[in-house]
């Protein structure tokens, strides 16, 4: 091999990548907030709703300080994959009932997918463990009724909002350690 010519910068530095990941997460958080407002406006919720198949919230923002970069990114990726699956399920199962939210739900799914790819690239650039994907989860059962589906939508968007809020805080904190 000959003398080493320098290469141009091929792609963003991981720290710049983290900045754009934070921006994307923030914009997804805002999308989710707006969608939640629309959902509550069209289908008012009677109290809080939960769904057993959703991931439990990673942790309180206060406990973030003790976290390490690998565990934050790995956990965040796993949780967001689960939410992506739930959003896809919601769109399939509730197509007609949630038609009024459809363009926004589609955008949410696309951006969620983009964020997941960004996180994976970041983990790859940093050479952090890319864990084997969880065994395929059993398919989500269709909602028992239209109202059951709407309750599920409230639970999915509410959980995703909390997860993204945690993600923004976590990623900003991690930026200081990179």
């Amino acid at each position: 091999p000959g003398p080493p010519p320098g290469s141009p910068r091929a792609s963003p530095d991981p720290r710049a990548e983290l900045d754009s990941t934070v921006l994307l997460t923030r914009s997804l958080l805002e999308d989710t907030r707006q969608l939640t407002i629309q959902l509550k406006d069209k289908f008012p919720a009677d109290g809080d709703h939960n769904l057993d198949s959703l991931p439990t919230l990673a942790m309180s923002a206060g406990a973030l300080g003790a976290l390490q970069l690998p565990s934050v990114l790995t956990r965040l990726r796993a949780d967001l994959l689960s939410y992506l699956r739930h959003v896809q399920w919601l769109r399939r199962a509730m197509g007609s009932s949630l038609k009024t939210l459809e363009p926004e739900l589609g955008t949410l799914q696309t951006r969620l997918d983009r964020l997941l790819r960004r996180l994976q690239l970041l983990m790859s650039r940093l050479a952090l463990p890319q864990l084997p994907p969880d065994p395929p989860a059993p398919p989500l059962a269709p909602p028992s009724s239209t109202w059951g589906g709407i309750r599920a939508a409230h639970a999915i968007l509410g959980g995703l909002h909390l997860t993204l809020d945690w993600a923004v805080r976590g990623l900003l904190l991690l930026k200081t350690r990179l």
Epitope: P70, Q120, L126, A127, Q130, P133
Partner: antibody, heavy 114, light 111 residues
Amino acid sequence: EVQLLESGGGLVQPGGSLRLSCAASGFTFSSYGGHWVRQAPGKGLEWVALISYDGSYKYYADSVKGRFTISRDNSKNTLYLQMNSLRAEDTAVYYCAAGVPDYWGQGTLVTVSS
Amino acid sequence: QSVLTQPPSASGTPGQRVTISCSGSSSNIGSGLDVHWYQQLPGTAPKLLIYSNEERPSGVPDRFSGSKSGTSASLAISGLRSEDEADYYCAAWDSSLYGPVFGGGTKLTVL
């Protein structure tokens, strides 16, 4: 400009040792994982070892496990590969790379022969 | 024997479109992990051509494109030029081997 410059290659007898170094410049080396990838004469690329940006995670190909050790010194912007118990089949050009890998050095030739 | 399977050779005439495939399994490409493509010109080090399945690093012409579906990925080169004659490698993380893996490489000849 991004540059990765390998050194330390050469001729060594079977069972011998070598330490490869890779000096990085032109980018924030400490924010990237570091790889060693090799290419035997006339063959394809074979991943050898990988270390995370901060040195906390290390991964090795089965063919070198227990014989090679990857390490890094971020204060010196340098990646290392300590190669022990070398075999004839380790003969190859060894490339240092960073990131996905996004950036590659030009390689250093390691020849294991008696 | 490489974990990712590529055809050993491919060819095309200038201006043509050529596609190189990369076949994997459920522990690498099929597990949702990214595929990257590298170009190695004769006598030089590999260069990143496509990352994250379809993203092009700055400086890579848009004649090069990548895609992924299921357990396979492919690299397409349109408007083939003589300077594209090189070896092309796909790579992905393998979760069962716990490390990156490369395809065996495809030698592209421009006729």
